[in-house]
């Protein structure tokens, strides 16, 4: 695939035309409930969640429930259907399995309560997609240089096991950070399609952290960071053998 | 009602190209996800491309069989969809249509690719 | 890609007559995401049954879809003259858009 997608605010066959859906976390200036998130993590299913705050104040509003629509006739009529499943994705969410779920159409979302229309929502299931985070970190070491205070190593990991890499349905561009353990601001580097990377001139007598997050190519946003990878070089004279070094 | 009307299509020699338009109207075109499907000569129905609206940035999408040959685009401002055709071979021969996400369909150009 | 396969190729059948159409996936496809076209010579396709079991407008009510996972079926249950025609049976769910390659209905 090509392009780029970021966020939809229409169904391409309606007359009328709604906010879009912000994939990440949305503040709630209202007690109204609101949708806070779709996500799909590999475009073959997604879950969409919501705050629900109104139900701990003192306003009774009654049942959230949610309706979607994803096709529409060529009367432009809007058939919305209820929520499919309110419980697999937790509380306040409703989940989309691969049956419910294409790429190929616009999705329209509402929440409702005692009848109303509370928040409503458009985009299409690519927009959404946010990967679960890179598995099975792990690293190489490469070369430590002739004055033995840096070293080079290699980084490896995995595609989240839920993506489709091998018959190209996902693909994935991932992003590395490291630092060292006492900072807190993370090193990125750019962008890549492989699961392996060099990472450069790190401190002999430090030890590093190196987190990996994916977002799919040119579309979607960055999921979750992996589990951290801890490296620690050891000190020059824990080698042996010098001729391997540059 | 909705109408898309193509244009452009027409006798090209293999290597060369081809813009193919389509006028749509009857519908806010800038909302709209349109797509072209090609008909090759006694055959079946072919997805060619799609391009998405504005709201969903001209996402665009394509079949493998034209990927790095074809463009597909938009002017919203003229109700225009566009694809441009490089690299033509001759099993690209086809009646091109345009869709307004494959529900409604408009008659369809002609375009022939021979030596 | 998921191909569709249509059967039978070639449908003789006389005005008044029911026909049966099918359309076999090569992985299960959900009912959300399978439409059936008719097309007639010298025309555009025309949406004729969308997600599996509805019409299209102006569609009549002769017609019908049914099926799911890897087989669907398009019945006309009473064939009329402006019926014969070559259908197509199109998915969008997993991969990208795909068509069958269509069943020709004609006058026995």
């Known amino acids: 695939f090509s392009g780029s997608e970021a966020t939809a605010a229409i169904l391409s066959r309606a007359p009328w035309s709604l906010q879009s859906v912000n994939p990440g976390l949305k503040t709630n200036s209202s007690k109204e409930p609101k949708f806070t998130k779709c996500r799909s993590p590999e475009r073959e299913t997604f879950s969409c969640h919501w705050t629900d705050e109104v139900h701990h104040g003192t306003k009774n509003l009654g049942p959230i429930q949610l309706f979607y629509t994803r096709r529409n006739t060529q009367e432009w009529t809007q058939e919305w259907k209820e929520c499919p499943d309110y419980v697999s994705a937790g509380e306040n969410s409703c989940y989309f399995n691969s049956s419910f779920t294409s790429i190929w159409i616009p999705y329209c979302i509402k929440l409702t309560s005692n009848g109303g229309t509370v928040d409503e929502k458009c985009f299409s299931v690519d927009e959404i997609v946010q990967p679960d985070p890179p598995i099975a970190l792990n690293w190489t070491l490469l070369n430590v240089s002739l004055t033995g205070i840096h070293a080079d190593i290699q980084v490896r990991w995995e595609a989240p096991r839920n993506a489709d890499i091998q018959k190209g349905w996902m693909v994935l561009e991932y992003e590395l950070q490291y630092k060292e353990v006492n900072e807190t601001k993370w090193k990125m580097m750019d962008p890549i399609l492989t699961t392996s990377v060099p990472v450069y001139s790190l401190k002999v007598d430090k030890e590093y952290e190196v987190r990996v997050r994916s977002k799919q190519r040119n579309s979607g946003n960055y999921g979750e960071f992996s589990e951290v990878l801890y490296v620690t070089l050891p000190q020059m004279s824990q080698f042996t053998c010098e001729e391997d070094f540059y | 009602e909705v109408q898309l009307v193509e244009s452009g299509g027409g006798l090209v020699k293999p290597g060369g190209s081809l813009r193919l338009s389509c006028a749509a109207s009857g519908f806010t075109f800038s909302d709209a996800w349109m797509d072209w499907v090609r008909q090759a000569p006694g055959k079946g129905l072919e997805w060619v491309a799609e391009?998405?609206?504005?709201?969903?940035?001209?996402?665009?999408y394509y079949a493998e069989s034209v990927k790095g040959r074809f463009t597909i685009s938009r002017d919203d401002s003229k109700n225009t969809l566009y694809l441009q055709m490089n690299s033509l071979k001759t099993e690209d021969t086809a009646v091109y249509y345009c869709t307004l996400i494959r529900d409604y369909w408009g008659q369809g150009t002609l375009v022939t690719v021979s030596s | 890609e998921i191909v569709l396969t249509q059967s039978p190729g070639t449908l003789s059948l006389s005005p008044g007559e029911r026909a049966t159409l099918s359309c076999t996936a090569t992985?299960?496809?959900?009912?959300?995401?399978l439409d059936w076209y008719q097309q007639k010579p010298g025309q555009a396709p025309r949406l004729l049954i969308y997600s599996t079991s509805n019409l299209a407008s102006g569609i009549p009510d002769r017609f019908s879809g049914s099926g799911s996972g890897t087989d669907f079926t398009l019945t006309i249950s009473r064939l009329e003259p402006e019926d014969f025609a070559v259908y197509y049976c199109?998915?969008?769910?997993?991969?990208?858009?795909?068509f069958g390659g269509g069943t020709k209905v004609e006058i026995k």
């Open positions: 992985s299960s496809v959900s009912s959300s995401y």
């Open positions: 199109h998915q969008y769910h997993r991969s990208t858009p795909t």
């Open positions: 391009i998405r609206s504005k709201a969903n940035y001209h996402a665009t």
